[in-house]
Amino acid sequence: SIPWNLERIIPAWHQTEEDRSPDGSSQVEVYLLDTSIQGAHREIEGRVTITDFNSVPEEDGTRFHRQASKCDSHGTHLAGVVSGRDAGVAKGTSLHSLRVLNCQGKGTVSGTLIGLEFIRKSQLIQPSGPLVVLLPLAGGYSRILNAACRHLARTGVVLVAAAGNFRDDACLYSPASAPEVITVGATNAQDQPVTLGTLGTNFGRCVDLFAPGKDIIGASSDCSTCFMSQSGTSQAAAHVAGIVARMLSREPTLTLAELRQRLIHFSTKDVINMAWFPEDQQVLTPNLVATLPPSTHETGGQLLCRTVWSAHSGPTRTATATARCAPEEELLSCSSFSRSGRRRGDWIEAIGGQQVCKALNAFGGEGVYAVARCCLVPRANCSIHNTPAARAGLETHVHCHQKDHVLTGCSFHWEVEDLSVRRQPALRSRRQPGQCVGHQAASVYASCCHAPGLECKIKEHGISGPSEQVTVACEAGWTLTGCNVLPGASLTLGAYSVDNLCVARVHDTARADRTSGEATVAAAICCRSRPSAKASWVQ
Amino acid sequence: QDEDGDYEELMLALPSQEDGLADEAAHVATATFRRCSKEAWRLPGTYIVVLMEETQRLQIEQTAHRLQTRAARRGYVIKVLHIFYDLFPGFLVKMSSDLLGLALKLPHVEYIEEDSFVFAQ
């Protein structure tokens, strides 16, 4: 008799754990910026504080009739999904509601900003336990709304936002496009993307993960014990806000970066049918459905990494793409991807004290993506070693020469634009372990890290016959930190990481051109963290 | 994630109005004006004036007051609806779009964003 969505996101071992703390005495507080809500509903009564905050535009139309239960519908349902007694994800959590959406579900960027400022002021006046802010709303891309989310996130608040219901790229909407926000798309009971009329869930690189968002049973504002089902990315975001609240009630010191990494790591992978998304968005959209992670005590000090895609560079000759990790994360490797295969590679550089991953378009190219591998490495000390391009016919070698530093990623950047001149760069694990090798006209960048117990190794997989892609996975217990494509076809599209899988993509036309001796190789750098061990390179 | 995607950014570095104030005449607008790419979602007439990160509390108020004063000299009444201190320095203002060029030339202004709708999802 448990609703499908709760069964999906809360594994069996957590169901019983929850029963031991009925009304929870958690200090986590969730702030909901939405419509007004019905505080007397049995699902949320006693858990919800309806603040006096109200910043909404007038309803449209002269004949609009304000009916309380309709005005409260969206917010009441979401409050119930987060902390409802019977259908809530985090049943013990206290919730504060701020009214930023009117009876028609419309608000303004300015009203939302004032709401976020109200939360910041409350935090300053009366510091409390961990705060989660749920933003089940979306408007067009707004630089200031994203900036406000960034500022609030940097004070330790965790923001969770709806990806949007426009069947579009979430990066075109705010707050969904703010990197500091956990952005949630919606899936149904079959783990497929939610369709809503002619539209549906948003997608793309700005979505962090998906969660149940179709036919979700929750509190109905029609009466104090009524329930109804609602659908949308708001419901999906409410599930993740509930999961985050539960994670923080167990471990109040978890940071935003840790929460996001754990949500990604423990989500259900590869169940979404990516064909629902536009072809150009499929590689950028995470195939992840949220589940409640176990506590860090149960899972030990795993090395956690995620892939961050840049925006598309655009097609101009010198266009660059930049991918950034969160401030707490380490950029362990940088790769690039171009649908046309015309790219001049990738490199890591420091901008304003932060390492960023950059990729460069080539003449005649349609644009590139930079792909950063962002990891949580406690007490890490990472640096970049680079060697300029060697003379024609010579190889360039870069390795980690500092003591106890291990290679976590390689990047290659070609000075020449003539794609026919250059050969693909390579990692060489055979002769000298832990070394990046570049071929003609390639500058080589090695990402080298020292951290207690960090050990890494290279794993390669090659295919000689025709193939659109070559993959290699890190085995259980190891985490993919670097991913490159090694010499093979004269034209590769690039390489990127999908969870623990390194994907090297080959241009369609290049498949026919290849001689049998030219294998395309996907090379993965796999690392693990064993706190008791010394940093080492595994051959 | 935060690249300015489908977004309108207009440079309004308009010539200074004949106002006789040295600091205004000397200040060429480097600030930009931004608005939602979806026209139906725009709220013209309400603007969020975002100031540089390090702007002090008193300077925020002075900038808002300066805008009101200069607008009044041109025969416009503007209303400061809210001043942002805690998350970012700035203020929310109701005014004619005719005054955007003037507002962009104020000291401390980083950019101005036209207000727009957000929707329940």
């Epitope: 008799s1 448990i2 609703p3 929850e18 029963d19 009925p22 009304d23 007397a40 049995r42 006693g46 239960s69 007694r85 019977d86 259908a87 049943k91 049973i217 029609d222 009466c223 104090s224 014990t225 009524c226 329930f227 | -």
Partner: antibody, heavy 126, light 106 residues
């Protein structure tokens, strides 16, 4: 079929705490589909809902009585209990326990009080 | 708090007659209203829920109607066992009961 039976002292002194237990038979109190409620009826008067509880011990009280009421559940004994503190003569009533569908699972039946126990009279007097 | 007012307080009728009981709410309760029957020394029994749905085992002579603030319980032809007190109850906002209507034999 499901039956509910109230038990507890019939006489309580003013300012003391009234304690009653409802024993459920013919069904499990541990079902997530139901709430378990207390309702009272002063002699010759109407009915008043006191509060409800679910199998997890999550409670929902009448705002006018909230400060004095505690409802608890013991799933191992298939019982739930009522404590009403600082009683006065105005608390003299027949106290009923009843089942109520939570509403989360519509198939569980109507979201109202059904069935009820037969009631127990509690008199507050010194 | 939503106040439910029942009328009349007492209804004196003979077996076979039609009984019409009224319940008025101080504000809209939509269709979230139920009717209960209580006989002396017994617990109340659910008759009608959500304004017009008969509970399991309730004879067809009992029917409910109304929505918003005005509701009616109708007993088309009174049987001897129908003489009792009838209460309405709402769940739009918390739970409150009406004061009751006593249906007695004339």
């Amino acid at each position: 079929q499901l039956q509910l039976q109230e038990s507890g002292p019939g006489l309580v002194k003013p300012s003391e705490t009234l304690s009653l237990t409802c024993t459920v038979s013919g069904g499990s109190i541990g079902s997530s589909s139901y709430y378990w409620a207390w309702i009272r009826q002063p002699p010759g008067k109407g009915l008043e809902w006191i509060g409800s509880i679910n199998y997890r011990g999550s409670t929902y009280y009448n705002p006018s009585l909230k400060s004095r009421v505690t409802i608890s559940v013991d799933t191992s004994k298939n019982q739930f209990s009522l404590k009403l503190s600082s009683v006065t003569a105005a608390d003299t009533a027949v106290y009923y326990c009843a089942r109520e569908n939570s509403g989360v699972v519509p198939a569980a039946g109507p979201n109202w009080f059904d069935p009820w126990g037969q009631g127990t009279l509690v008199t507050v007097s010194s | 708090e939503i106040v439910l007012t029942q009328s009349p307080a007492t209804l004196s009728l003979s077996p076979g007659e039609r009984a019409t009981l009224s319940c008025r709410a101080s504000q809209s309760v939509s269709s979230y209203l139920a009717w209960y029957q209580q006989k002396p020394g017994q617990a109340p029994r659910l008759l009608i829920y959500d304004a017009s749905n008969r509970a399991t085992g309730i004879p067809a002579r009992f029917s409910g109607s109304g929505s918003g603030t005005d509701f009616t319980l109708t007993i088309s032809s009174l049987e001897p066992e129908d003489f009792a007190v009838y209460y309405c109850q709402q769940r739009r906002n918390w739970f409150t009961f009406g004061g009751g209507t006593k249906v007695e034999i004339k």
